[in-house]
């Protein structure tokens, strides 16, 4: 089921999904001056069976020629719930995300793709936050958000992350001295996650991947 809203916005932070749950849709958006090819797909869809997940449909853009506007993809009414825009990031894969059951890896870029990606997330999706360059993380807990639900009501959990300017030294009362890089996840947080759900896989993955995925982006 689709999540009703966007993941929470944290000042001076961006978020990223390590892998995308089956059912996730990615709009086929083209950059200015280009449009979807006629009869082209509106979106890519993460689908799969118990052993393998992959993106159905391919996005293709062609020159608008006389038109100089971006063709916007408008999802069907039931698809309009989640229109999360994320900036295009270089497709780097710290681990093989395709091996994560029920999930797809980041789709590779397509020719003349728009600079931002619009994802339609589904319930159970987890995203991970990092502070933008020039800001550092003060952690009160895990820097992640999960789209949860109960009988049709969906909501993203609040990530426990505050990003502060490099020069600022103020800390929250009772706050431990923050680590220089944003991978620091309290030991108690990872050790108590022993569930057999989709979340366990992603959370364990996050514990091992956060460092590589976030530091790689700064290199």
């Amino acid at each position: 089921e689709l999540c009703d809203d966007d993941p929470p916005e944290i000042p001076h932070a961006t978020f990223k999904a390590m892998a995308y749950k089956e059912g996730t849709m990615l709009n086929c958006e083209c950059k200015r001056g280009f449009r979807r090819i006629k009869s082209g797909s509106l979106y890519m869809l993460c689908t799969g069976n118990s052993s393998h997940s992959s993106w159905d449909n391919q996005c293709q853009c062609t020159s608008s020629a006389t038109r100089n506007t971006t063709k916007q993809v408008t999802p069907q009414p039931e698809e309009q719930k989640e229109r999360k825009t994320t900036e295009m990031q270089s497709p780097m894969q710290p681990v093989d995300q395709a091996s994560l059951p029920g999930h797809c890896r980041e789709p590779p870029p397509w020719e003349n793709e728009a600079t931002e990606r619009i994802y339609h997330f589904v319930v159970g999706q987890m995203v991970y936050y990092q502070c933008v360059q020039g800001y550092r993380a003060l952690h009160r807990g895990p820097a992640e958000s999960v789209c949860k639900m109960t009988h049709g009501k969906t909501r993203w959990t609040q990530p426990q992350l505050i990003c502060t300017g490099e020069m600022e030294t103020s800390q929250f009362p009772g706050e431990e001295k923050p680590q220089a890089s944003p991978e620091g996840r309290p030991e108690s947080e990872t050790s108590c996650l022993v569930t057999t759900t989709d979340f366990q896989i992603q959370t364990e993955m996050a514990a091992t991947m956060e460092t590589s995925i976030f530091t790689t982006e700064y290199q």
């Epitope: 749950k21 159970g124 949860k148 639900m149 009988h151 108590c192």
Partner: antibody, heavy 121, light 112 residues
Framework: EVRLQQSGAELVRSGASVKLSCTAS????????IHWVKQRPEQGLEWIGW????????EYAPKFQGKATMTADTSSNTAHLQLSSLTSEDTAVYYC??????????????WGQGTLVTVSS | DVVMTQTPLSLPVNLGDQASISCRSS???????????LEWYLQKPGQSPKLLIY???NRFSGVPDRFSGSGSGTDFTLKISRVEAEDLGIYYC?????????FGGGTKLEIK
Amino acid sequence: EVRLQQSGAELVRSGASVKLSCTASGFNIKDYYIHWVKQRPEQGLEWIGWIDPDNGETEYAPKFQGKATMTADTSSNTAHLQLSSLTSEDTAVYYCTVFWYGNNYAGFAYWGQGTLVTVSS
Amino acid sequence: DVVMTQTPLSLPVNLGDQASISCRSSQSIVHSNGNTYLEWYLQKPGQSPKLLIYKVSNRFSGVPDRFSGSGSGTDFTLKISRVEAEDLGIYYCFQGSHVPPTFGGGTKLEIK
């Protein structure tokens, strides 16, 4: 292993209050909605309400508004149900349950063992 | 509140027989998002309820395929194709599409 462990049976006087607990293991309660359900002796199930432990938001069935108060403590991974101004009508087993969802399921997949509250006059 | 009416109240069966339980809602329980949050639970004596079926017809993991759910709108049915001794207990339907969510009154499946 996912488990919901509820506190022990309570014998309480009419007019008093009682606070029940439901401690989760195997998952973080903040990532789910915790529901409470009442079952009077030899009767059916009644939904009391849910709590979102991540932000404390609650939703109650109208008949339990003012009677039940749900809270949660994410640091101990525990949800609580407080019942006030107890009467004989409140004598029942109270269950906590989690609305669980995955790629191929969604519902009250895990339940606590129940806490019997007996109200004496 | 949406009233969930189960019939019959009691269902005596022979082991190996088919059993059918009906659940009718006082109004449509299609959620505004298009889903129908109709679930079936089994409660055995002295135990907590167990999830059998969610969203009308989907079996929860580990539930034998002799259990099947069907229906739409306001009329729903739980069928057990060949009743086994471990299936005995009280079956409840539940709707989560409207607030407050409500349970049916229960149907007791027992041996003839």
